[in-house]
Amino acid sequence: AGLKLMGAPVKLTVSQGQPVKLNCSVEGMEEPDIQWVKDGAVVQNLDQLYIPVSEQHWIGFLSLKSAERSDAGRYWCQVEDGGETEISQPVWLTVEGVPFFTVEPKDLAVPPNAPFQLSCEAVGPPEPVTIVWWRGTTKIGGPAPSPSVLNVTGVTQSTMFSCEAHNLKGLASSRTATVHLQALPAAPFNVTVTKLSSSNASVAWMPGADGRALLQSCTVQVTQAPGGWEVLAVVVPVPPFTCLLRDLVPATNYSLRVRCANALGPSPYADWVPFQTKGLAPASAPQNLHAIRTDSGLILEWEEVIPEGPLEGPLGPYKLSWVQDNGTQDELTVEGTRANLTGWDPQKDLIVRVCVSNAVGCGPWSQPLVVSSHDHAGQQGPPHSRTSWLVPRGSSAHHHHHHHHSAWSHPQFEK
């Protein structure tokens, strides 16, 4: 007789956690190597048993120590003989147990007295599965067929909910869902003015607890004194928890405070934070920049700049910048309206300009003055002669703001 895998199709039902032995009877072959297949995939299982019934008749077992839902499926065995594969009739394995949850109630945050829903679903086998709802330790609904939706009209405090699934094998309890009450957010903290200019201020803050409802926006209120008239109120979507305040008055004292809102309403304001905008840089350039040749070098003079208004504040030192054709350049600060320039190369053209500074920065540069090398060579006259040979060049002259120290000898500026 040829190779035969004996047995009719079988439906086998076992309880979850129980051991299972699926058997496969092989006739017509000595000591077969039996392979087990589940749902089309070879079962890699070293836990196989064999019983020799006779020399040409063997029974193989697939041993499952503890059946689980994932073991359920269609099994068969197969044996190779002479390059051909014989396949047995299938065994349909069903694993029954207490219900298994596919959907469990989730934690929620809701406004007081607002309606909400919770969902629960469990499956067998065995079916049917029924659902019972619990609110804390009180049964509140059911039994109802799975899946089940619990409609709650509202709660006034944090409340626990769970569901229980029943079938012929017993019951299973879901996770406990906590329904939290939403509340107004807490006040922001760490309110900081991160960047200041004469007319703008950048503000950043940390949000307080959101009251279990998404923060939707924050309001930045600005006054010229704590509790004074509101100058500005900016509503910003969040995150990020930052805001740029624009169009502020220079050199002015302000205070700001921040609050944030969720769907239920706004938080309290954070404490007032004082700040002061910077003043304006000087608006005017020094006028009438001119030069006088001396034996020791070159004297540069210009007219004093008078502040145009209180926002400029007191005007401080002057900044003098010069550059030569050979690339040598320098910047220096001088207190008055006169500087003695020495150490420059008279064989090269010289460009000089000056600005006045205050606490904010330097104002506009004066018109550049150019000293030509041939002018130096040809100039005669007594020391401190007020004859000027410096001629303003057009505004297309180089504007150097940065410091650059070259290997050339640096000229000296003396008051």
């Epitope: 000591e31 890699q44 020799p52």
Partner: antibody, heavy 125, light 108 residues
């Protein structure tokens, strides 16, 4: 009486190939499986792999997959463990085991009742 | 790769009960086997399929399994029980075997 006779101790250099053997007697060779177990000096047991009764199915432990080959010759009732390129870390005692024992529930492959005396393999330069 | 974890050593006085544990994630689904190895000898099967005693093994040896833990119990340990004990099981996928690291039982 079931007997598993293993080949003698061997000393090899790293990179060398080696095959050790395990000859079974006292039972029908194709009624049972053969497993190989390694034990490094002063260390624990390590399951290397198993070959089915007909040699059609082999299983290997993850540490040994691709490094060793298990085979069997039914005509001589002999199982083999082969290395293509030995490493110093292969120095160990190698046991062949008859996998499968008769119990009231049937023949259990993982019932390791009969062990060979072991083959000591030393790999040193 | 799959691992079985055993305590490195257990000490008892003669006549006391020795318990050796073995933990592995697949033990709820896969059987545990216990092997005894005395110094210089090949291992000997003591317990198979969690709790069944192998032939020729004294009744003081018993096995149990619960969840991810298998336990070998020697009730009234004797000096001759001093040995290394290894648990053995199969990987979660069922495609390779694994020994635990071994437990040295000392009977003082």
């Amino acid at each position: 009486e079931v007997q598993l006779v293993q080949s003698g101790a061997d000393v090899k250099k790293p990179g060398a190939s080696l095959t050790i053997s395990c000859q079974a007697s006292g039972y029908t060779f194709t009624d049972y499986w053969i497993s190989w177990v390694r034990q490094k000096p002063g260390k624990g047991l390590e399951w290397m792999g198993r070959i089915s009764r007909h040699g059609s199915q082999t299983y290997y432990g993850p540490s040994f997959q691709g490094h060793v080959t298990i085979s069997a010759d039914r005509s001589t009732a002999t199982a083999y463990l082969q290395w293509r390129s030995l490493e110093a870390s292969d120095t160990a005692m190698y046991y062949c085991v008859r996998a499968g024992g008769q119990t009231s529930g049937g023949t259990i492959p993982e019932y390791y009742q009969h062990w060979g005396p072991g083959t000591l393999v030393t790999v040193s330069s | 790769s799959y691992e079985l974890t055993q305590p490195p050593s257990v000490s008892v006085s003669p006549g006391q009960t020795a318990r050796i544990t073995c933990s592995g994630d697949a033990l709820p689904k896969k059987y545990a086997y216990w092997y005894q190895q005395k110094s210089g000898q090949a291992p000997v099967l003591v317990i198979y399929e969690d709790h069944k005693r192998a032939s020729g093994i004294p009744e003081r040896f018993s096995g149990s399994s619960s969840g991810t833990m298998a336990t070998l119990t020697i009730s009234g340990a004797q000096v001759e029980d001093e040995a290394d004990y290894y648990c053995y099981s199969i990987s979660p996928a069922g495609n390779y075997g694994v020994f635990g690291g071994g437990t040295k039982l000392t009977v003082l």
